[in-house]
């Protein structure tokens, strides 16, 4: 059997830092037999067997033009084996980021931080903490460490599914290469990397005869479980087209009607979503959708009041108890002062 | 010569926006995390933002964090740190840093002046 | 974020004492501490990595050492060229921070 313990990465390749000395084995030989050492296609005698080094090859302060194939040799000229040497770095611990749309699963994404210039691959693993007492903390089965799966292709990145909502976990992603490993623990919990996607379907309608309404409505986002323990809060802005400034108002359900458009001009709209609780942050922008209010005179049946969901002109309370799950069904209001003085408008 | 040179600061109103640049030579850039360190006049270092090789995963301190973007171009061995809505807190000295890994600095420009003030 | 505390905040020490700084992390760091040394209107330099691994070309009067939360710098015997400030800084964590600093200068 070969004196020489076969590194991770490819056969027939071996390792060494720059800078460092390095040591190349002979495979083909039975440790500490004498060899003779020359450099592929070069004749020059690099190590006679005189040595008192067996079966290796020292090289001391290595750079990149020691890298390339080697051969040895026995006494007997017959061939010792072929090795080529790569040079690189140990790992450096890879930074690690996770984040959940759901309130189920989440994922976590790496990268080097130092190119080794090696091969690398990367384990990916997790436990879920389990803090027992004041300051004690236990391991059981149920804790794990788990595998976390990683995506196929070599895209760099694990998905934790079935993962609870309230629980602690530490993620462990450990770069490995032929010089080395080096870990990367990351404390994460759901509550704070819960980042929803976008709410869907977002559309801008007119509320015909009425020329500073808009009503918008949209969806959950697909991600978000569809029996959802967890609710969304939304939160819409709207602007005239070219106006620099956003409105923000945060609707009660899955559509608002803007009481305060500006007449004849289209209105970009947009909607983020976020857990009905606090929990994590916001969801990014969904993709705009624009409307234009009605320019047309008040339809001959003016729509029941309950029919039109527009919000309170007092700014919504943020830390007002959560509301039940959100409901399409528009809460009945009376008429306010803008809508009589939208009317006066409309009807002069 | 291994050497970091930055560049681009000056003084700036409050709410203005500058971009800092910082240029590597004589290591091979793309192989290494980058860094933003500040030093406030008379102050003590405060880390401000870091980015791996690839630039896929960047890191902001708190302070700096939706104002400031950090990003690197590999082919110009350039790292730049774009400071936007600047405040008078964030006057400093602005210094680029190497690698080797992630937090740990073993390589260091000159610093750049970067003054808010109206 | 991982919060670090250096004392003394300054000293003054004569030419040959043996100095030395300690840095204290709120929470286990393991070793993953370094120690800076910053001259007046310089840059920081490297000293000590990994809280006790010398630096090439840093002189061998410089030593770390500690793991976990407690850290100490030595300077064995304290020369001119060493008036600076001397900063302790994690890297644990994935957002580094630095101690506040100590001043050292020569009685």
């Known amino acids: 059997s070969s004196p020489c313990p076969q590194a991770w990465g490819p056969p027939g390749v071996q390792y060494g830092q720059p800078g460092r000395s390095v040591k190349l084995c002979c495979p083909g030989v039975t440790a500490g037999d004498p060899v003779s050492w020359f450099r592929d296609g070069e004749p020059k005698l690099l190590q006679g067997p005189d040595s008192g080094l067996g079966h290796e090859l020292v090289l001391a302060q290595a750079d990149s033009t020691d890298e390339g194939t080697y051969i040895c040799q026995t006494l007997d000229g017959a061939l010792g084996g072929t090795v080529t040497l790569q040079l690189g770095y140990p790992p450096a611990r890879p930074v690690v980021s996770c984040q959940a749309a759901d309130y189920e699963n989440f994922s976590c994404t790496w990268s080097p931080s130092q190119i080794s210039g090696l091969p690398t691959r990367y384990l990916t693993s997790y436990r879920k903490k389990t803090v027992l007492g004041a300051d004690s903390q236990r391991r059981s089965p149920s804790t794990g460490p788990w595998p976390c799966p990683q995506d196929p292709l070599g895209a760099a990145r694990c998905v934790v599914h079935g993962a609870e909502f309230w629980s602690q976990y530490r993620i462990n992603v450990t770069e490995v290469n032929p010089l080395g490993a080096s870990t990367r623990l990351l404390d994460v919990s759901l509550q704070s990397i819960l980042r929803p996607d976008p709410p869907q379907g977002l559309r801008v309608e007119s509320v015909p005869g009425y020329p500073r309404r808009l009503r918008a409505s949209w969806t959950y986002p697909a991600s978000w479980p569809c029996q959802p323990h967890f609710l969304l809060k939304f939160r819409l802005q709207y602007r005239p087209a070219q106006h620099p400034a956003w409105s923000t108002v945060e609707p009660a359900g899955l559509e608002e009607v803007i009481t305060d458009a500006v007449a004849g001009l289209p209105h970009a709209v947009r909607v983020s979503a976020r857990d009905f609780l606090d929990a994590g942050t916001w969801s990014t922008w969904s993709p705009e959708a624009w409307g234009t209010p009605s320019t047309g005179t008040i339809p001959k049946e003016i729509p029941a009041w309950g029919q039109l969901h527009t919000q309170p002109e007092v700014e919504p309370q943020v830390d007002s108890p959560a509301p039940p799950r959100p409901s399409l069904q528009p809460h009945p209001r009376l008429l306010d002062h803008r809508d009589s003085v939208e009317q006066v408008a409309v009807l002069a | 010569e291994v050497q970091l040179l930055e560049s681009g600061g000056g003084l700036v109103q409050p709410g203005g926006s500058l971009r800092l640049s910082c240029a590597a030579s004589g290591f091979t850039f793309s192989w290494y995390s980058m860094t933003w360190v500040r030093q406030a006049p008379g102050k003590g270092l405060e880390w401000v933002s870091s980015?791996?090789?690839?630039?896929?995963?960047?890191q902001y301190a708190d302070s700096v964090k939706g104002r400031f973007t950090i990003s690197r171009d590999n082919s110009k061995n350039t790292l730049y740190l774009q400071m936007n809505s600047l405040r008078a807190e964030d006057t400093a000295v602005y210094y680029c840093?190497?690698?080797?890994?992630?937090?740990?600095?073993?390589?260091w420009g000159r610093g750049t002046l970067v003054t808010v003030s109206s | 974020d991982i919060q670090m505390t250096q004392s003394p905040s300054s000293l003054s020490a004569s030419v040959g004492d043996r100095v030395t700084i300690t840095c204290q992390a709120s929470q286990d760091i393991n070793n993953y501490l370094n120690w800076y040394q910053q001259k007046p209107g310089k840059a920081p330099k490297l000293l000590i990595y990994?809280?006790?691994n010398l630096q090439t070309g840093v002189p061998s009067r410089f030593s770390g050492s500690g793991s976990g939360t407690d850290f100490t710098f030595t300077i064995s015997s304290l020369q001119p060229e060493d008036i600076a400030t001397y900063y302790c800084s994690q890297f644990e964590s994935q957002s580094p921070t630095f101690g506040p600093g100590t001043k050292v200068d020569i009685k």
């Open positions: 980015i791996v090789p690839s630039g896929g995963h960047t």
């Open positions: 990994d809280a006790s």
């Open positions: 840093a190497k690698g080797p890994g992630w937090g740990s600095f073993d390589l």
